[in-house]
């Protein structure tokens, strides 16, 4: 056996393996405090104890032991605001993107035992504490129930709930995925007196039905009311119930603004302003007009009033209202004025202050960059994130505006904290922003820190991923560059992942990873060790991600370029970028591939079928193939309606099937999960049918009973192994 040769430190590093990726060997941790006051928070420790922390007294103790958690197999918890009870969540069963059902147990912290009598039914679709005390609201079998105390009998608030027909307090499929982005549709008033909720009536919505094979003799059929483009939509109503005496008055319906109610519309969000003031946002089905309506409780008639002079209209003349969603208001202490992000006259999304009318709004931020999210408004400060710093759209820094000052002064809280390591932040604030946690996602190793809300001083490092740092020491990681390229009057930001021993004088295969959906962003300054990191590290492939027209945070001119014509500029801009990359001199023109998932699968398919000859091969995972097959709220936001008098022509022209002939000269791998509730298997079935009809050869793989994420461990392993083989074959890389 030959003796081991000593290698100096520099050469002992190894490349990433596919196994590393599939095992999650190099996954990172973040730390988000579960705030319970101005200076106190809870956190679940590594060993599953729920630990209480007080920042000011520095005390910490176990509030709920892992043995109590384990006794009911709990995976999550929630402390009641009066700190007397904790709900324990177990039997988690995923439904759609956000929704799941679970079993809930209530633990009495005073007595140290579970609450017996009037136990909660199972499985529950949603459960939450009131903001004050320990009232419980929950949704069971599409109806809302209320408990004044955990041991009390429940009071049934709604009776209309019916599976797949009427949903109370929880959204239906399309609202969950495309509008609310939550599993709930109920909101407590700040003092816990009122409970607002939405009723979704899906009775007239067409059903998507697909087989779930399981392991029985017969497959079962999954039925989901799912409105595709142009179909009948859910009918929504918003109600508010007085939870102090729910039986006395019953739920009161909140009126829809007249200008919205005159045609099909959506409810988009609800924000409690004070204990007797609520703000509702509505959107026309043609999603270029949004109305924010402020409603007040009138004691005399015990009714909710939404006067016309408290309706604020937001309209887009160049595209759709809002970004991906219409932004929500952040109200001031006066409970009348608010801050909101919307497009300024130059088409950049910025913070505006609305006191009386939108027309008289005062612009708070401005510039050729975008304000992205308002985290918190306090008496004297407003905290927000933006991509202003140094002009990189893919960064996120946190800023504080001192609103007490005149003019308001602005400070970047994060820009210079750990400049090399951290350029992409989010934040989590305690009550009244006395303290906050910063979570940095990269480009270096993620780090979570605790800060003083007055001085912004760092108090403590909460998580710095030391173990990950150590385990990466002996790994040859690729080099990541974020740069921009220009074409005509357009600027495209790109991220390039270069193999460890990259040499500009050599030629490398190129893989384009694309998403490209409206208001998305792929070029972000974040840390990641994933499949494409492996492809660069081990297989010597150059990876590039490009944000073309239609992507976010670079102004409405860039964003709205794709309005009513999806599938054109997103593809064109990927092709432009590839040509520019070839000009750089280190790309092997004969070995260029493209891959994408979901919207990215649509773009990669269209790019492969562009007839340019740029791509040798490509992969589409769970692609959309026609916007008529996708959800109404999403498709119509960007494409209008598939009707003759609206945009049917482009709906038809923009399908993957229409380009079937053009796949003849590329190697195409088409992949889809058969139980995809989001982008239905129908999309890939139709691509396959068109390719067969055109007598075009292609490769395909389906994943039985897998959804849009193809998330099961076995499926993920198979998927990435299969795609790796396909790419290596395409690029003539030895196994």
């Amino acid at each position: 056996r030959p003796s081991r040769v000593y290698k100096p430190e520099g050469n002992t590093k190894r490349a990433l393996t596919l196994k590393d990726i599939l095992n999650g060997t190099f996954s990172y941790k973040t730390y988000f405090p579960n705030w319970i006051s101005e200076q106190e928070y809870l956190h679940q420790s590594e060993d599953d104890n729920i630990v209480f922390y007080n920042i000011e007294t520095r005390e910490s103790y176990i509030i709920l032991s892992n043995s109590t958690m384990k006794s009911v197999n709990a995976t999550d918890y929630g402390l009641s605001p009066d700190r007397q009870f904790v709900y324990l969540e177990s039997d988690y069963s995923k439904l759609w993107r956000y929704s799941y059902t679970a079993t809930y147990y209530i633990y009495d912290l005073q007595n140290g035992e579970f609450v017996r009598g009037y136990e909660l039914p199972r499985p529950i679709q949603y459960l939450c504490w009131s903001p004050v005390g320990s009232k419980l609201a929950y949704v069971y079998q599409n109806n809302i129930y209320l408990k004044q105390r955990p041991g009390d009998p429940p009071f049934q608030i709604t009776y209309t709930g019916r599976e797949n027909r009427i949903f109370n307090g929880i959204p239906d499929w399309v609202y969950e995925e495309e509008m609310l982005a939550t599993k709930y549709a109920l909101w407590w008033s700040p003092d816990g007196k009122f409970l607002a909720y939405v009723e979704f009536n899906d009775s007239d919505i067409p059903i998507i039905a697909y087989s779930y094979y399981g392991d029985g003799q017969y497959p079962r059929t999954i039925n989901i009311p799912y409105p595709k483009a142009g179909a009948k939509n859910p009918v929504v109503r918003v109600f508010i119930v007085d939870t102090t005496y729910p039986h006395h008055v019953g739920p009161m319906e909140v009126p829809v603004p007249e200008m919205i109610a005159s045609s099909d519309y959506y409810f988009s969000w609800l924000t409690w302003v004070s204990s007797e003031r609520v703000c509702l946002q509505w959107l026309k089905r043609v999603q270029n007009v949004s109305v924010l309506s402020i409603c007040d409780f009138r004691e005399d008639w015990h009714a909710w009033e939404c006067p016309k002079n408290q309706e604020h209209v937001e309209e887009s003349r160049t595209g759709w209202a809002g970004g991906f969603f219409v932004s929500t208001p952040a109200f001031s202490q006066d409970a009348t004025s608010y801050y909101k992000i919307f497009s300024d006259k130059d088409g950049y999304k910025h913070i505006h202050y609305i006191k009386d009318t939108v027309e008289n709004a005062i612009q708070i931020t401005s510039g050729k960059w975008e304000a992205i999210y308002i985290f918190r408004v306090t008496q004297d400060s407003l905290f927000y994130s933006s991509n202003e710093f140094e002009g990189y759209p893919g960064r996120r820094n946190i800023y504080r505006i001192s609103i007490g000052n005149s003019p308001p002064s602005k400070k970047c809280v994060t820009c210079h904290l750990r400049k090399e390591r951290c350029q992409y932040y989010t934040a989590s604030f305690s009550y009244k922003a006395k303290y906050y946690a910063l979570v940095c996602y990269g480009p270096g190793l993620p780090i979570s820190t605790l800060h003083d809300g007055r001085t912004d001083q760092e108090i403590q490092v909460l998580e710095e991923n030391k173990e990950l740092e150590n385990s990466l020491r002996n790994i040859q990681l690729p080099k990541v560059e974020i740069k921009k390229l220009k074409d005509g009057g357009l600027t495209f930001w790109y991220k390039m992942i270069l193999p460890p021993q990259f040499d500009r004088s050599k030629k490398y295969p190129l893989l384009i990873q694309v998403y490209g959906g409206p208001c998305s962003q792929s070029v972000k300054s974040v840390f990641a060790v994933n499949w494409i990191t492996y492809l660069a590290s081990k297989e010597g492939i150059v990876i590039a991600l490009v944000d073309g027209r239609g992507t976010a945070f670079q102004g409405d001119k860039f964003l709205h370029a794709v309005y009513r014509k999806l599938g054109v500029y997103e593809v064109e801009d990927q092709l432009t970028a590839v040509r520019k990359f070839i000009e750089m001199g280190f790309i092997d023109e004969e070995r260029i591939a493209i891959w994408g998932w979901s919207y990215g699968g649509y773009v990669s398919s269209l790019a492969l079928a562009s007839g340019t000859g740029l791509f040798k091969c490509g992969i589409a995972v769970a692609p959309v193939s026609s916007w008529e097959y996708y959800a109404s709220i999403y498709s119509e936001r960007f494409m209008g309606l598939p009707t003759k008098d609206d945009n049917l022509e482009h709906y038809k022209n923009s399908t993957v099937m229409a380009r079937a002939e053009y796949f003849r000269n590329v190697d195409y791998l088409l992949i889809h999960g058969t139980a995809d509730d989001n982008v239905h298997f129908q999309n890939s079935a139709q691509i396959a049918k068109a390719l067969v009809n055109a007598q075009v050869d292609f490769q395909a793989m389906w994943y039985s009973d897998q959804n849009h994420g193809i998330l099961s461990g076995r499926s993920q392993n198979h998927l990435y192994t299969h795609m790796t083989h396909f790419l290596k074959q395409c690029f003539s890389l030895s196994d």
Epitope: R237, V254, P255, C295, A303
Partner: nanobody, 121 residues
Framework: EVQLVESGGGLVQPGGSLRLSCAAS??????????IGWVRRAPGKEEELVAR????????RYADSVKGRFTISCDTSKNTAYLQMNSLRAEDTAVYYC????????????WGQGTTVTVSS
Amino acid sequence: EVQLVESGGGLVQPGGSLRLSCAASGFNIKDSSTYIGWVRRAPGKEEELVARIQCSAGSTRYADSVKGRFTISCDTSKNTAYLQMNSLRAEDTAVYYCAGRSARSYSYIYWGQGTTVTVSS
């Protein structure tokens, strides 16, 4: 033009019953912005909202003085609201007005012409 027309008033003995009707025209009582109420005025007493209903949601509210005795309801097909008054007492004697209130603007209330209810033996 909005109109509210009440009917059903009259003389009744204590313990008796009456049903008041309020026929609305010019607006839709099943609209979520509409509340219908019965307001009574008696000499020397403060005006009192005895009951109100939001027909769209079926949400009802009663003054403590009539709780358990009066029932407010609506028939949206007839665009009419009702007040069923049982176990009437002498102190229920008053002119009963039907009032229509819009949740989109509380600056105005539509009123009917009123119907008199007299409870006396």
